[in-house]
């Protein structure tokens, strides 16, 4: 950022899309702003008109191409701008150079669905999207399941640490409703964070047999 | 070189109006914004608004809203600024000034060499 | 709007003396992205003016390093280390931080 009341932070979701927030103290004026993406070894530049999101901050995503080309990597430095205008010039507000893969937050894992059933565990399968085909298998993944009467943060979490695209849940209670959520991380990059959680697959597990135990 | 040729000096009757010619050269019209600044005889200077040529889109300073339109013509590099109901008190030399599109150091950097006009009965 | 209020308003120099400019403005005119755009602008007798200093100490190409800005948040200075006879005119400062930009009511330099 250009100085400390401004916060301009950006991630990569290791493919076409940056994202990026930016926060400012002090409510500017009615004020069109936008991120321009101008990369230091690529042809093309980006801009996204900065949206509201609350009262002093402002969401953009710069969509570099079809969702699944890989249009960045390691070596790229992309030099991010907030512009504002002011009458009918720009004004920098805020300005990094971007290093995607020290900064990727990934796409919420898809694709949720319930493989088998039983009484006390449930099989559980996902796949991720738009990931690049550079992590190989170095991502890991974080779970939760929802049980009755508890919320998501109560959730324990349960951690993956390699590339695995289901779970086998235990020790669940017969006939009962659950929900489950899972996201994902690369294990590369400085500023790496874990993706949005998964739309929560809801499920219910087999009632007991009648006559046992 | 850049260049800001203005139109010459004019003598309005008040309640007229007056149209000042910026003739821009040495540089691309379009990718820079022009200012109108005025200096009311013996007095300081006054921002009176400014046109990005590119698009044509136009700021005024709330002081002149309602009197001042300024506009472009990028078949000739030229931009315009006019001001209507005149009275006395807008006797001034009028400049035009050349300013980066993205204002991250100077306002403007090079000045034409001023319109004088002259409001009289 | 920020007022800009330049002393003195006439100033006597003596060729090769220093001077020294005050601007300041009616409230603080660091910009929300953290710079200040102060400038100073000079105008010689019969002509247009011309841009001296940026973003209150930086000097635009070509202008002599005699010239120098400083200060922050209301008040600044431009300085002449050494005044020359073709630095005669009138100086003045402008703000670019808060529309509507203004400029200072200006401060005549002429040699003793």
């Known amino acids: 950022a250009v100085n400390g009341t401004s916060r301009f932070t950006c991630f990569y979701n290791s493919r076409a899309n940056i994202s990026c927030v930016w926060s400012q103290d002090g409510a500017l004026q009615d004020t069109s702003c936008q991120v321009h993406a101008w990369p230091d070894r690529r042809r093309w530049n980006q801009t996204c008109e900065l949206l509201p999101v609350s009262q002093a901050s402002w969401a953009c995503n710069l969509i570099l191409g079809t969702p699944d080309s890989q249009k960045l990597t390691a070596v790229d430095i992309v030099t991010l701008r907030v512009m504002c205008r002011e009458g009918v010039r720009w004004r920098m507000m805020a300005i990094q150079d971007f290093k995607p893969f020290e900064n990727l937050r990934l796409m919420a894992p898809i694709s949720l669905q319930v493989v088998h059933v039983e009484t006390h565990r449930c099989n559980i399968s996902w796949k991720i999207s738009q990931a690049s085909h550079y992590f190989e298998r170095h991502l890991e993944f974080e779970a939760r399941t929802l049980s009755p009467g508890h919320t998501w943060e109560e959730a324990p979490l349960m951690t993956l640490k390699q590339k695995q695209e289901w779970i086998c849940l235990e020790t669940l209670t017969p006939d009962t409703q659950y929900e489950f959520q899972v996201r994902v991380k690369p294990l590369q990059g400085e500023f790496t964070t874990w993706s949005p959680w998964s739309q929560p697959l809801a499920f219910r597990t087999k009632p007991a047999a009648l006559g046992k135990d | 070189e850049v260049q800001l040729v203005q139109s010459g000096a004019e003598v309005k009757k008040p309640g007229a109006s007056v149209k000042v010619s910026c003739k821009a050269s040495g540089y691309t019209f379009t990718d820079y914004v022009i200012s109108w600044v005025r200096q009311a005889t013996g007095q300081g200077l006054e921002w009176m608004g400014e046109?990005?040529?590119?698009?044509?889109?136009?700021y005024y300073n709330e002081m002149f809203k309602g009197r001042v339109t300024m506009t472009r013509d990028t078949s000739i590099s030229t931009a315009y600024m006019e001001l209507s109901s005149l009275r006395s008190e807008d006797t001034a030399v009028y400049y035009c000034?050349?300013?980066?599109?993205?204002?991250?150091?100077?306002?403007?950097?090079?000045w034409g060499q001023g319109t004088t006009v002259t409001v009289s009965s | 709007d920020v007022v800009m209020t330049q002393s003195p308003l006439s100033l006597p120099v003596t060729l090769g003396q220093p001077a020294s400019i005050s601007c300041r403005s009616s409230?603080?005119?660091?910009?929300?992205?953290?710079?200040?755009?102060l400038e100073w602008y000079l105008q010689r007798p019969g002509q247009s003016p011309r841009l001296l200093i940026y973003k209150v100490s930086n000097r635009f190409s070509g202008v002599p390093d005699r010239f120098s800005g400083s200060g922050s948040g209301t008040d600044f200075t431009l300085k002449i280390s050494r005044v020359e006879a073709e630095d005669v005119g009138v100086y003045y400062c402008?703000?670019?931080?808060?529309?509507?930009?203004?400029f200072g009511g200006g401060t005549k330099v002429e040699i003793k």
């Open positions: 402008f703000q670019g931080s808060h529309i509507p930009w203004t």
């Open positions: 046109i990005y040529p590119g698009d044509g889109n136009t």
């Open positions: 409230q603080n005119i660091v910009h929300s992205n953290g710079n200040t755009y």
């Open positions: 000034a050349r300013g980066s599109y993205t204002y991250d150091n100077y306002a403007m950097d090079f």
